[in-house]
């Protein structure tokens, strides 16, 4: 008995698609061995049609594929555009066709039901609208028009021109008779139900002179589109429900074990808390279509999703829906990165953002997720250098360390910086990731003066105190601009007196500007890093003024512990040109700047090695 298992019989109709899932014991050998789908011939040989090694026979070219899911011990064979020639006996298996582990599958593709001559076929998805056209002759123009449904040998009246409406179609059907000269009447049925499926008969007039036309109405359940995405990655559900429901509330829901559908997000402002910080419902187009983006995919996000339209913002029978079956692949190409990063007020965080390493030239972005209404994510910074004004001097996007990861540094943290942020590029949308910044109790590790006024033409010395725990780190000073932070030469001044509980390893590293020029005005960061990996930073604003008193100016170490002065940036509303974003609708049309909050100086970020999912921790 073979341990491979699958459907013994698959039946479908011409033009349809099938998705055949085969199961195997997920041993290490089985997971990585060749998977195949072959057709059994009269000779008993089984001819490969598609395999996991990329082979696709000419008969299947452009209409079939095989996808392996090693973590589940399954593989799926998708075959589209079925014809009756595809009927036959097949095997799905592992290894070599002739002697591997396999399972027999019978595929039967039928023509579909025989219909009376001249029958018009209408194929419509459940919940949508159908317009049945019924021609008639001139002599029947003044006579009664009607639509019947054939049930077995009987015909049941559905609607007629004398205002009769069958109760099963109440409030969702209308019969239209055009003006003179047009010899056709139409019946429009809205919000189609599965039970509407069947053969209908249009009739105009009565007796032997009556006009008749058969209509076959095929109401289809939405076939779930199979969606395979990587753990930690992102999925986008594109939902196009038609103009008929363009102005009706939209929703995405997830089918649960009780056969109901829990709203994940809708346009009425409802959102499942499990998706907090990692979901956006993009604004509708004029045609009523919309999309939902979910980032930071988890294994528990797997399941059947439906999008739909209804005034209540939730699933109702007879309204249009679209369906997806989401599978989350645990053998993910997206690397693990912290989902939570912790910092202290006045401190800093350095966030690592993954991107598809094949797209090193793509533009990188960082945005702040906002939960109001359908969610939006205004851009804060991009790799070309644009930074929202209120983040001036405290936010930078660095291409380092590269090879699939970029870094975002945010300092001068306040409690208002707590929240969810998204890393994204203008390339592969599946690599969008979410990180939550939490502000915890503690003091910044790096100590710098609150603000500094330098005198034109003189020497300025700015100290930065590093605690002993950073003894092995590289220390640096850089000048911030909206295109990055340009490293400057700095000087190690020896042990720092700012950390009394520390030994010789605590350092004072200063930046010297000599002589001070007008161009020196601006933000300066001192920070630590290890190779291309950035740690904590602290920011100082240097103002430059005219010379008043002769002599050089030195900011004493004592002043470094003084409370930093507040610097409030322009908090006005600002448009950000949303350049090069693959799906600009991901972001709201207006980029509204959040409240700037307190712009205190100082810096702190920490890495807690106790969890692969979190960065941070309180001060040591």
């Amino acid at each position: 008995k073979s341990p491979v298992f699958g459907p013994q019989e698959v039946s479908s109709v011409e033009g349809n698609s099938v998705s055949i899932k085969c199961y195997y014991p997920p041993t290490s050998v089985n997971r990585h061995t060749r998977k195949y789908w072959c057709r059994k011939g009269a000779s008993g040989r089984c001819i490969t049609l598609v395999s996991s090694e990329g082979y696709v026979s000419s008969n299947y070219a452009g209409r079939a594929n095989l996808t392996n899911f090693p973590e589940n011990g399954t593989f799926v064979v998708n075959i589209a555009q079925l014809s009756r020639d595809d009927s036959g006996h097949y095997k799905c298996g592992l290894g070599i066709n002739s002697r591997g582990l396999s399972f027999d599958v019978s595929l039967e593709v039928s023509q579909g039901p025989e219909l009376p001559n001249g029958t018009e076929v209408y194929t419509v998805d459940v919940g949508r609208t159908v317009t049945i056209k019924c021609p008639f002759k001139t002599e029947n123009a003044p006579k009664t028009k009607a639509l019947y449904k054939k049930i077995g040998q009987t015909s049941v009246l559905v609607i007629d021109s004398r205002n009769y409406v069958n109760p099963n179609y109440k409030d969702r059907i209308r019969l239209r008779i055009p003006g003179t000269g047009q010899l056709i009447f139409t019946v429009v049925i809205d919000r189609l139900r599965l039970s509407d499926h069947g053969l209908y008969l249009c009739q105009a007039g009565d007796g032997s002179n009556r006009d008749e036309k058969n209509a076959d109405l095929q109401v289809l359940e939405p076939e779930p589109e199979l969606v395979y995405e990587d753990l930690r990655g992102s999925v986008t559900f594109h939902c196009a429900l038609g103009l008929e429901v363009a102005n009706v509330a939209k929703f995405l829901c997830r089918v649960n074990s009780r056969e109901t559908c829990d709203v994940v997000i809708n346009t009425l402002g409802k959102r499942d808390s499990a998706f907090e910080g990692r979901i956006l419902l993009n604004p509708q187009d004029k045609d009523g279509s919309f999309s939902v983006v979910i980032t930071g995919l988890r294994k528990e996000d797997e399941g059947r999703y439906l999008c739909g339209a209804h005034s209540d913002g939730q699933l109702q029978e007879g309204w249009p829906i679209q369906a997806w079956q989401l599978f989350v692949n645990e053998e993910s190409t997206i690397p693990r990165s912290p989902t939570v990063v912790k910092g202290v007020a006045g401190g800093s965080v350095a966030v690592l953002c993954p991107y598809n390493p094949k797209e090193s030239q793509s533009l990188k972005y960082w945005c702040l997720w906002e939960g109001a209404q359908n969610g939006r994510c205004p851009l804060l910074v991009e790799s070309q250098g644009l930074v929202q004004e209120q983040y001036e001097g405290r936010l930078s996007l660095l291409q380092e360390p590269g090879n699939g990861t970029f870094t975002v540094i945010l300092n001068q943290l306040t409690t208002q910086d707590a929240g969810f942020y998204w890393c994204l590029t203008n390339g592969d949308t599946r690599w969008r990731t979410t990180v939550e910044i939490k502000i915890i109790e503690g003091e910044p590790n790096l100590k710098v003066p609150g603000n500094v006024t330098a005198v034109l033409g003189e020497t300025l010395n700015i100290p930065c105190h590093f605690p002993c725990k950073f003894s092995s780190y590289e220390k640096y000073w850089c000048k911030w601009s909206n295109t990055g932070c340009q490293t400057l030469p700095s000087q190690d001044e020896g042990p720092s007196e700012a950390f009394v509980n520390c030994d010789e390893n605590s350092r004072l590293v200063s930046l010297t500007l000599n002589p001070v020029t007008r161009a020196d005005e601006g933000w300066y960061w001192c920070g630590v890093k290890q190779g291309h990996f950035y740690g904590e930073t602290a920011a100082v604003y240097v103002a430059v003024e005219e010379k008043k008193v002769a002599g050089s100016r030195y900011v004493s170490p004592a002043k470094a512990d003084a409370a930093p002065d507040e610097k409030v940036l322009d908090s006005g509303v600002r448009e950000i040109e949303n350049k090069a974003i693959q799906d600009p609708r991901l972001f709201a049309e207006e980029k509204v700047v959040a409240d700037t909050g307190d712009q205190a100086g100082g810096s702190r970020a920490s890495v807690d090695s106790s969890s692969s999912e979190e960065q941070g921790g309180s001060s040591k």
Epitope: F5, P7, Q8, E9, V10, S11, S12, V13, N16, S17, V18, S19, I20, Y23, N72, T74, G112, V126, L194, L220, E221, E223, P224, V255, N256, S257, R258, E259, T260, C261, G303, R304, L306, L315, E317, Q325
Partner: nanobody
């Protein structure tokens, strides 16, 4: 909610046939698959057959011991699933349960079915 009601069980001789029916009512429009499980005296409940569907495509799964003897089918209009059992054997004696699922990652697993009927007794005497 979805309600499942089985019928068609009974006492038959070995080699005879029986047809079980399972009628579903309630919110069946999101149902993705329906199947039959059985529990013999003193045994665990086990998978017998399942039918899943997507539009007009049907997928039928059977356990090895019933292949070629049992046939699962469905009537979409009546929301009913049938199990035609031919060439019955004494070892087929069991309570047969109908089950329905919204999402099936593996049709053989009991815990993937969200709804269960009360069961119908099938007894095959030799």
């Amino acid at each position: 909610q979805v309600q499942l009601v089985e019928s068609g069980g009974g006492l038959v001789q070995a080699g005879d046939s029986l047809r079980l029916s399972c009628a579903a009512s309630g919110r069946t429009f999101t149902t993705y698959g329906m199947g039959w499980f059985r529990q013999g005296p003193g045994k665990e409940r086990e998978f017998v057959a399942t039918i899943t569907w997507s539009g007009s495509t049907n997928y039928k799964y059977y356990t090895d011991s019933v292949k070629g003897r049992f046939t699962i089918s469905r009537d979409n209009a009546k929301n009913t699933v049938y199990l035609q059992m031919n060439s019955l054997k004494p070892e087929d004696t069991a309570v047969y349960y109908c089950a329905a699922s919204t999402v099936l990652t593996d049709p053989r697993r009991l815990n993937e079915y969200d709804y269960w009927g009360q069961g119908t007794q099938v007894t095959v005497s030799s």
